[in-house]
Interface confidence: low
């Protein structure tokens, strides 16, 4: 194969791979017809002048996971056909000016996971055809104006996992073709207005795991093609009324792990493609009417682990396609009977770990497709007659860890539970809290006459088959999808991003996996 170095393997497809700790310099002679060269996991510490001079047909060069700390400016001379160059996972602290000069065909440049302290406009001024630039996992503290001005064709730029404390509003102004911009895991405290104005083709913007406290009102005003916006794990305490008003293509928005205290109506401006909205781990205390009314296609809404104590009756107006609603671990004491009335397609509702004392009889009146209801760990003493009777698809109902009052009034519920025991699961069953003489006994098998001996209680066979709710209109039957979406924590959908880990101690939270939002 035109002379393959002994420490490398060469394939008929002109691919050369050189690996191993014994390699301390670029092996020679390399096959002149090599089109792909990989130098991986070696002890090479530097690249000298023109080590690749004789392989001018090279298209892809990967020099990764080495001890590389020094490169001379002419190291890549004569590689005019090179399209892909990776120097990732080395120990580079500085890049010589002119290092990429002559790489006129270069489209992908990977410099991630090094120790780069700075970049300068001159570093990339020759790379006019570059489409992808990976700089994540370095020690960059600042990006100077002009650093990317010559990269007008760039479509993907990753600056995540650096030490950036601020961004100039002009640094991205010439990147009109950029589709993906990642700034996650930096130390950004605010983003200047206008920073993203030039990014008219941007589809993904990753700003999660920074220290952003405030979003400028028109920050995303010009990014009409944005599809994925990651703002989770920041310090955002409020959302300007118009901040999301110009994002009609958005289909993924993460805001979990911030300090949001309130959501104003209309804050989520028309987003016809948004399917999931993650708002857990904030400080939201109430939900006003119509707060989500523009999100007509929303299927998953996660509001768990907030401080919600009040939900206005019209808070969920417009969410006709919602399948999953997570409200667990909040401070809810009561709910309006109409609060879920618009959620005709709801399949799964998590209300565990609240302070609910009672539920209105019509609370689930129009939600005929409900398959799972989590009510454990509340303050419920009883439930209204017939509350679940119309829920023909209900297959999971969690009622344990409530202070059930096992007097004569509990009989209808007990009898319904007897007939529907499989729906309660086998892990934990609801037990009586009062009266004291039956405390701790299973609600399902308790003899109410023993619990309250002085009261004669007629046996009630079950809840009525067709419940009548005096103050409630009758709702038409709705068809609902029978499969439930698994609610796991949102994983940002690209590989070079650290996944958010959600604490999943089900014994503490009382959650099934489907509710661990």
């Amino acid at each position: 194969y035109h002379g393959c170095p002994s420490e490398c393997t060469c394939s008929r497809a002109s691919q050369v791979e050189c690996t191993g700790a014994r390699i301390v310099a670029v092996p020679t002679p390399l096959p002149w017809n090599a089109m792909s060269l990989q130098i991986l996991n070696t002890h090479i510490t530097e690249l000298n002048e023109s080590p690749f001079l004789n392989i001018s047909a090279l298209i892809a060069l990967r020099i990764e996971k080495n001890e590389l700390s020094r490169i001379t400016p002419g190291a890549f001379r004569n590689l005019g056909s090179l399209r892909y160059l990776s120097l990732a996972n080395n120990k580079l602290q500085v890049l010589p000016i002119g290092l990429f000069q002559g790489l006129d065909s270069l489209e992908s440049l990977l410099l991630s996971s090094n120790q780069l302290l700075q970049i300068q406009p001159a570093h990339f001024s020759q790379c006019s055809n570059l489409k992808e630039l990976q700089l994540h996992g370095n020690h960059l503290e600042y990006i100077p104006d002009g650093a990317f001005d010559h990269l007008v064709g760039l479509t993907k730029l990753n600056l995540g996992k650096n030490s950036l404390t601020h961004i100039s509003p002009r640094v991205f102004q010439h990147l009109g073709n950029l589709q993906v911009l990642r700034l996650y895991e930096n130390r950004l405290t605010d983003i200047p207005m206008g920073t993203f104005d030039g990014l008219v083709n941007l589809q993904e913007l990753a700003l999660q795991q920074n220290q952003i406290g405030l979003l400028s009102p028109g920050l995303f005003h010009n990014n009409h093609n944005l599809q994925r916006l990651y703002l989770s794990n920041n310090h955002i305490s409020q959302l300007p009324p118009s901040v999301f008003m110009q994002l009609p293509q958005l289909n993924r928005l993460t805001l979990f792990g911030n300090s949001l205290k309130e959501l104003s109506p209309g804050i989520f401006g028309p987003m016809p493609n948004l399917r999931e909205l993650w708002l857990y781990d904030n400080h939201i205390s109430s939900l006003p009417d119509n707060v989500f009314s523009n999100l007509r296609q929303l299927q998953v809404l996660i509001l768990s682990r907030n401080q919600i104590s009040f939900i206005s009756p019209g808070a969920f107006n417009g969410l006709t396609e919602l399948r999953e609603l997570s409200l667990h671990t909040n401070a809810l004491q009561d709910l309006d009977g109409n609060v879920f009335r618009m959620l005709a397609n709801l399949q799964n509702i998590s209300l565990q770990n609240n302070r609910l004392r009672q539920l209105p009889g019509n609370i689930f009146a129009n939600v005929n497709g409900l398959m799972a209801i989590q009510l454990q760990n509340n303050q419920l003493e009883n439930l209204p007659l017939g509350i679940f009777d119309h829920l023909g698809k209900l297959c999971e109902l969690r009622l344990y860890d409530n202070p059930w009052r096992c007097d004569s009034d509990i009989l209808p519920l007990r009898n319904w539970l007897l007939l529907n025991q499989p729906r309660l699961g086998t892990d934990t069953v609801p037990v009586c809290f009062s009266p004291a003489n039956v405390r701790g006994q299973s609600l399902i098998i308790i003899n109410v006459n023993v619990a309250v001996p002085s009261v004669h209680v007629p046996e009630v066979p079950s809840y009525p088959e067709t419940p009548w709710y005096p103050d409630t209109p009758s709702y038409p039957d709705t068809t609902s999808v029978s499969s439930t979406t698994e609610l796991t924590s949102p994983v940002e959908d690209y590989t070079d991003l650290t996944t958010i880990q959600v604490t999943d101690d089900r014994s503490v939270w009382g959650m099934t996996q489907a509710q661990s939002g």
Epitope: P169, M193, H221, H224, S242, M245, P270
Partner: antibody, heavy 116, light 107 residues
Amino acid sequence: QVQLQESGPGLVKPSETLSLTCTVSGASINIYYWSWIREASGKGLEWIGYVHHSGGTNYNPSLKSRVSISVDTSKNQFSLRLKSVTAADTAVYYCARDTYGPFDYWGQGTLVTVSS
Amino acid sequence: EIVLTQSPSSLSASVGDRVTITCRASQGISNYLAWYQQKPGKVPKLLIYAASTLQSGVPSRFSGSGSGTDFTLTVSSLQPEDVATYYCQNYYSAPWTFGQGTKVEIK
């Protein structure tokens, strides 16, 4: 009450630069965007571009090479400069408040004629 | 850029008539559409935004509807003071663009 008032010369020579200023009263220029729109005779309305108090701008691509819009927050003003004008740039020029799209307050408009 | 096409270009109707103007976008713009009224020699005035939301102070005889590519402005009962040119405007995608206008006159 929000008011906008355009000012600047009504006559500009061909190839010269058209300069207009819009003074905003009754509202802070530090909120929303601020746009210029023009109406040529019989041609309908054409958006020229907007500016934000930070200096961020967005221009109509058809005019981008000739236009610049700037803001002076201390004076609550924003300005339009259009280079290399021709007779086709003769129009009534309006400034307007851009509430992230819709224009809810407009200036009275100023007619600019390009003629030698 | 998004092109907005209004129809008709002009119309004449009697006082009290129901008048309808349509605006078609060259691509879907959700409900990011506004309507303006411009009386002769006057400044354009915002009537409706978000396709159907009436701007404060605008008479209730004006209404808007539509989403995606097809939009409608309706005047339920035409009044003499409604003589004007009406424009639709896209604010879904920059550059903001206007329709060519519909001139409304009284018979």
